[in-house]
Interface confidence: medium
């Protein structure tokens, strides 16, 4: 039970006090007791419960006409059962007794009031009255946890606006309200109570720029909501009528968790006694609600796809047809960014990452806009953000970034359990240098900090700086699987490719050509590839780099070798000894449920079939996956990217609720 104030009683004159239902009020009967008195008794109105404990050891007893010794070891506490109809209508009488004096009486007039700030602390999507419920001043994780949740109101319900909803002080309509969390203030007081008392709603100054609270006028249009707390207003005096009254507030978060903001916001209601104009306002009671701002959550390839994004560029019609067919098979919406909007920037994967935020009452997709800011710079903010589609960005918006800040370098694993620790929403994966040095690249610290601060998908740093572009999607992917952990990790594998080519040569196919059918591309015989010492050395280095990540992924995702599939792939080292794919990089695939859009490798054709395609199909089809090989050679591959780099996917949010996990 919440702690109320301390009330001192004195025989000289009656004491008047307020007691808030649901709180425990202490009664100081000793400090002003008559000198000669050695014991006391208490009588109270039926609406008041008095508890007397004398310790140690504590003997606890509800009052009757018994007398108690008057010593500091006696604790007297009051609670009230019902709210008062009129001021001071509940009475407590203390009688003091001494050996030689007649009894001395002290009177206490109590006013019982109901004041409670309620939010959805049980995470059911509904606000329930919180009397006799757990303490709402703490926020706890897990299925038995409690605490309310706020969404950053980062969508744009007003299509005429260029800003996010949380960037203004207005409630646009009921759509805008649904992105907010309801908080209700319930009061029950005597009619004249607020002539001498005031309620103040407030937020800590350190949190005022992270939240905005609107007060709703019941029964009126939502446009009548007015802002009462926010970046400019840390406190607000409420106009509350006496009697029984409910007041609704709508709360929106303005910032995501980050290094300087753990994501918790406390809203407090304070009851002030303003009866004595000579004295400062005295705090009679406080009630608080703690909200946690919902984190931004990424979705892995194993989540069902809902929408595919790609760019229309010069001469990529065939590529788009293939992606369209794949999207239709997977029953996905398809959004194409036209040439005039992408300004020849085809790398849809690098520009953004689509995740979501979730509260019990609402789930919202949210696009995380990378700071790479090339031709697609405006696409996330102009075309993706909109009604019920949020937006967030981090990192410097003008320079100071590297290729590792593009979101081809940002992936997330499916859910995993690692040495007994569960990651029910998976773990974020991003590429980094192996060791910080003058020429190494790493993801911008602001991005790393943001990803870590979300808490629910603890990031793993992989090593990708060995690649020319430097993105993790150049050597890994995840695909759904019907068995084991529900997925397989796919890793690019030079070892597997050499093994395949060696087998083909042993079977007499050493003359078969790589890149057959590609105009203006020098074709290479299997036997020449196998005898090319420089290429071997290059791929030996690449294999070591991928093995480094293999070990890291096994350890950090709790994987066994049988959870990993090696996809045959060769690389070559270019400027500064950085690697790029020797032929279209098959692991850089588009995963739409069981439908895979894989870069067509143009491998050696043996018995009428590309041996690389055949090998990949033999590895993936037993998992119920359907492989479609997409020709991206001239439009993507020679520009150092593939199918995954050129597409993006919005996926279904997890059914698992993030607040039920324990980070």
């Amino acid at each position: 039970m919440a702690q109320g104030t301390l009330i001192r009683v004195t025989p000289e004159q009656p004491t008047h006090a307020v007691c808030v239902l649901g709180t425990l009020t202490q009664l100081d009967i000793c400090s002003s007791a008559p000198e000669d008195c050695t014991s006391f008794s208490i009588n109270a109105s039926p609406g008041v419960v008095v508890d007397i404990a004398h310790g140690p050891p504590a003997k606890k007893k509800s009052t009757g006409s018994s007398t108690w010794p008057l010593d500091p070891g006696v604790e007297v506490t009051l609670t009230m059962k019902v709210a008062s109809g009129s001021t001071g209508d509940q009475k407590v009488q203390i009688s003091y007794y001494g050996p030689k004096t007649p009894p001395v009486k002290a009177l206490l007039y109590l006013t019982g009031v109901e004041i409670s700030l309620c939010a959805d602390i049980t995470r059911t999507g509904k606000v329930k009255p919180t009397r006799a419920v757990k303490d709402q001043r703490t926020w706890t994780w897990g299925p038995c946890g409690q605490g309310a949740i706020l969404l950053v109101n980062c969508d744009r319900d007003n299509l005429e606006s260029s800003a996010m909803d949380c960037e203004d002080d207005e409630v646009l309509d009921s759509e805008d309200l649904q992105d907010m969390s309801l908080m209700t203030l319930s009061t029950k007081t005597p009619k004249d109570f607020f002539t001498n008392h005031t309620l103040v709603l407030h937020v800590a100054r350190s949190e005022m720029d992270k939240v905005r609270v609107f007060q709703a006028t019941r029964g009126k249009l939502s446009s009548k909501c007015s802002v009462v707390l926010g970046p400019k207003w840390p406190s607000h005096y409420l106009m509350v009528p006496g009697g029984k009254h409910n007041m609704d507030f709508y709360v929106e978060a303005l910032a995501f968790p980050d290094t300087d903001f753990p994501g918790l916001i406390t809203l407090t209601i304070s009851l002030l006694d303003t009866s004595n104009l000579e004295l400062p306002e005295a705090v009679v009671f406080q009630d608080s609600v703690v909200f946690r701002v919902a984190p931004w959550i990424m979705t892995p390839n194993t989540q069902p796809p809902q929408e595919v994004y790609a760019c229309s560029i010069f001469e990529n019609e065939d590529f788009l047809k293939s992606v369209t067919t794949l999207a239709m098979k997977a029953k996905c919406k398809l959004t194409i960014c036209p040439e005039e909007e992408n300004m020849d920037d085809q790398w849809m994967q690098d520009e953004m990452e689509i995740g979501y935020i979730q509260a019990p009452h609402k789930t919202l997709p949210v696009v995380f806009d990378s700071p790479r800011n090339r031709g697609l710079k405006e696409f996330p903010i102009k075309r993706v953000m909109g009604p019920d589609f949020g937006y967030v960005t981090r990192g410097p918006q003008t320079g100071g970034i590297s290729g590792l800040d593009s979101f081809g370098n940002l992936e997330v694993s499916p859910p995993v359990t690692v040495r007994g620790k569960e990651y029910p929403l998976g773990r974020i994966l991003f590429g980094d240098s192996c060791y910080p040095s003058n020429d190494s690249r790493q993801m911008h610290q602001a991005l790393q900090d943001f990803l870590s601060a979300q808490q629910v998908q603890a990031p793993v740093k992989l090593y990708s700086d060995w690649l020319s572009v430097g993105h993790v999607d150049e050597f890994l992917s995840f695909v759904p699987a019907p068995d084991r952990k529900g997925f397989r990790l796919l890793l690019a594998s030079p070892r597997s490719c050499y093994k395949l080519f060696q087998e083909q040569q042993n079977e007499g196919h050493g003359e078969a050509l790589l890149f057959e059918g590609i105009k203006k591309k020098k074709q290479q015989k299997i036997k020449n590839i196998l005898s090319n010492k420089t290429l071997r050395e290059h791929n030996s280095f690449v294999e070591r780099c991928i093995d480094w990540n293999r070990e890291l992924l096994k350890r950090e995702l709790g994987l066994a070798e049988s959870d990993i599939i090696d996809i045959p792939q060769l690389f070559k080292l270019k400027e500064f000894s950085k690697a790029e794919a020797f032929f279209p990089n098959m692991v850089n695939m588009l995963v739409l449920g069981k439908h895979l859009g894989i870069p067509k490798p143009f491998g050696p054709v043996i018995n009428g079939r590309c041996c690389l395609e055949e090998k990949v199909c033999s590895l993936l089809e037993p998992l119920g996956l359907q492989c479609t090989f997409i020709n991206d050679f001239f439009t993507y591959h020679i520009r150092h990217g593939e199918v995954h780099c050129g597409t993006n996917v919005r996926r279904k949010p997890f059914s698992f609720k993030w607040w039920n996990m324990v980070p």
Epitope: D432, S433, C434, Y435, S452, A458, P459, D547, W548
Partner: antibody, heavy 119, light 109 residues
Framework: EVQLVQSGAEVKKPGSSVKVSCLAS????????VSWVRQAPGQGLEWMGG????????KYPQKFQGRVTITADESTSTAYMELSSLRSEDTAVYYC????????????WGQGTLVTVSS | EIVLTQSPATLSLSPGQRATLSCGAS???????LAWFQHKPGLAPRLLIY???IRATGVPDRFSGSGSGTDFTLTISGLEPEDFAVYYC??????????FGGGTKVDIK
């Protein structure tokens, strides 16, 4: 899990050098970083530096720069730590330890090698 | 370089009691890359916790780690006889300046 076996105890004169070896088995040597950590009598643990054999990158903290050399021989899965210009305060147990991360988080440890510097 | 300060230097407790060991950093530890080790005389140190709160393989769940930024804690919920040892924290985010704390000795009361 990686097993690390270190060379035996050494007694050295001040001003001389010592080279301690660390043989790794039970994993791909290339995929680890190898750190060296020492503990002087009654003192805490002190990181002396490390090497990533795969990239032949060695790193040393300021304190040991120029006096310690860490090397690795991939063919024998062995790492070495050589400390020169020995003084009595270098008397310590020297441990090698492997790391699976970009950072030098020491995961599996060797049994330790006691080096005594005494005239 | 990041300096790690462990407190208390010695903790005298009985088996079954809860042990709380602190590790303070002179500046925030990058990405909460902080580990805890147990060290017994004549043996190699043993990794207990890494990345602030993740238990290493085979470490009993009575060991738990928490904290962020500059303040970190190792908690042993109920001391077993084999837990009496010296405990070190290590930060490994400030490469190449990896540092250990001075250690906390947990001994039998």
């Amino acid at each position: 899990e990686v097993q690390l076996v270190q060379s035996g105890a050494e007694v050295k004169k001040p001003g001389s050098s010592v080279k301690v070896s660390c043989l790794a088995s039970g994993g791909t040597f290339n995929n680890y970083a190898v750190s060296w950590v020492r503990q002087a009598p009654g003192q805490g643990l002190e990181w002396m530096g490390g090497i990533i054999p795969m990239f032949d990158i060695a790193k040393y903290p300021q304190k040991f720069q120029g006096r310690v050399t860490i090397t690795a021989d991939e063919s024998t899965s062995t790492a070495y730590m050589e400390l020169s210009s020995l003084r009595s305060e270098d008397t310590a147990v020297y441990y090698c330890a492997t790391s699976y991360f970009r950072q030098w988080l020491t995961w599996d440890w060797g049994q330790g090698t006691l080096v005594t510097v005494s005239s | 370089e990041i300096v790690l300060t462990q407190s208390p230097a010695t903790l005298s407790l009985s088996p079954g009691q809860r042990a709380t060991l602190s590790c303070g950093a002179s500046q925030p530890v990058s990405s909460n890359y902080l580990a805890w080790f147990q060290h017994k005389p004549g043996l190699a140190p043993r990794l207990l916790i890494y990345d602030t709160s993740i238990r290493a393989t085979g470490v009993p769940d009575r060991f738990s780690g928490s904290g962020s930024g500059t303040d970190f804690t190792l908690t042993i919920s109920g001391l077993e006889p084999e837990d009496f040892a010296v405990y070190y924290c290590q930060q490994y985010g400030g490469s190449p300046q990896i540092t250990f704390g001075g250690g906390t000795k947990v001994d039998i009361k």
